[in-house]
């Protein structure tokens, strides 16, 4: 039975040219995390695997940094980065948990910041 829950940063916004941390946290389960995938719509951004460590997709290597923890840091944000992001936790024996984050990248210098896990 899947007892865990994923807490995410929810809906967040950031300035164009800035950076943001995407963060998910799996709680209420002692399941073993074997891999975490970060995806943007249907594109794979990065994988953190227990055996092999981090892998960043080649097309995002310049703008995506692993961490902190199992999170992902997006840098040099553009308006095109606006959209949905998913953290997908592969666990044993529970199976797969998915969290959703919506990021809005604003042209304006006044971006409303989410409360949790947000970097200034």
């Amino acid at each position: 039975m899947m007892t865990g829950t994923i807490e995410t940063t929810g809906n967040i916004s950031a300035e164009k040219g800035g950076s943001i941390i995407l963060q998910c946290h799996l709680s209420s389960t002692t399941a073993q995390v074997t891999q975490v995938n970060w995806e943007q719509q249907d594109q794979l951004l990065a994988i953190c695997n227990a055996d092999l460590g981090w892998h960043i997709s080649p097309s995002f290597k310049d703008r995506v940094a692993p961490g902190p923890g199992l999170g992902l840091t997006l840098q040099s944000l553009t308006v095109n980065d606006t959209g949905e992001y998913f953290c997908i936790y592969h666990t044993y024996p529970d199976g797969t948990y998915t969290g959703r984050i919506f990021l809005e990248v604003l042209e304006s210098s006044v971006a409303e910041h989410g409360a949790r896990f947000q970097i200034p």
Epitope: T30, Q32, A50, L70
Partner: antibody, heavy 118, light 107 residues
Framework: QVQLQQPGAELVRPGASVKLSCKAS????????MNWVKQRPGQGLEWIGM????????RLNQMFKDKATLTVDKSSSTAYMQLSSPTSDDSAVYYC???????????WGQGTLVTVSA | DIQMIQSPASLSVSVGETVTITCRAS??????LAWYQQKQGKSPQLLVY???HLPDGVPSRFSGSGSGTQYSLKINSLQSEDFGSYYC?????????FGGGTKLEIK
């Protein structure tokens, strides 16, 4: 049944490299990372590194980066670890261990006692 | 590198007693932890994987628990064949460090 066969002992001269073998049988050799572990007499276990037989992907403990080289021969289901320039500090039992992804299964060899002595 | 701090280093107990061995990781290892038993002159044997799961053939008196950075191995109603050394090992990235070991001796 599953077996990881290792020579019982190797006597090595200081400075003369030695290649330890570990022959696997009874399980899918390419499905398990082959790990190597060092244990000095009366001491704990030290993880040296691991190699994935399917593609020879290797992860090495940085403490052993100048000491150990891991290879595999898929055709004979055998893993090897070469120890370079052995000194008395390298005298120990060396285990090979086929360990499934994320530690979900483990098959251990009986270990090879390496004695470095002139 | 992740450090694994295992305690106690040694334990003197009687048959029938219950013992608990703990392992603390220097950072979150997300339940990627195994426990091994090693008897004198023999190779280690897997007791617990994924922090709390027992492989086939391991007696149910053994149990593993924990999450995050804190893990423990509990042995209920200790049998004479349980005496030996116990090690934890993490499986979150590399190097896959072992704990320093716990030597379980007969009182």
């Amino acid at each position: 049944q599953v077996q990881l066969q290792q020579p019982g002992a190797e006597l090595v001269r200081p400075g003369a490299s030695v290649k330890l073998s570990c022959k696997a049988s009874g399980y899918s050799f390419t499905s398990y990372w082959m790990n190597w572990v060092k244990q000095r007499p009366g001491q704990g276990l030290e993880w040296i590194g691991m190699i994935r037989p399917s593609d020879s992907e290797t992860r090495l403990n940085q403490m052993f980066k100048d000491k150990a080289t891991l290879t595999v021969d898929k055709s004979s289901s055998t893993a090897y670890m070469q120890l370079s320039s052995p000194t008395s500090d390298d005298s120990a039992v060396y285990y090979c261990a086929g360990i499934h992804d994320y530690g979900h299964g483990a098959y251990w060899g009986q270990g090879t006692l390496v004695t470095v002595s002139a | 590198d992740i450090q694994m701090i295992q305690s106690p280093a040694s334990l003197s107990v009687s048959v029938g007693e219950t013992v608990t061995i703990t392992c603390r990781a220097s950072e979150n290892i997300y339940s990627n932890l195994a426990w091994y038993q090693q008897k004198q002159g023999k190779s280690p044997q897997l007791l617990v994987y994924a922090a709390s799961h027992l492989p086939d053939g391991v007696p149910s008196r053994f149990s593993g628990s924990g999450s995050g950075t804190q893990y423990s191995l509990k042995i209920n109603s200790l049998q004479s064949e349980d005496f030996g050394s116990y090690y934890c090992q993490h499986f979150w990235g590399t190097p896959r460090t072992f704990g320093g070991g716990t030597k379980l001796e007969i009182k």
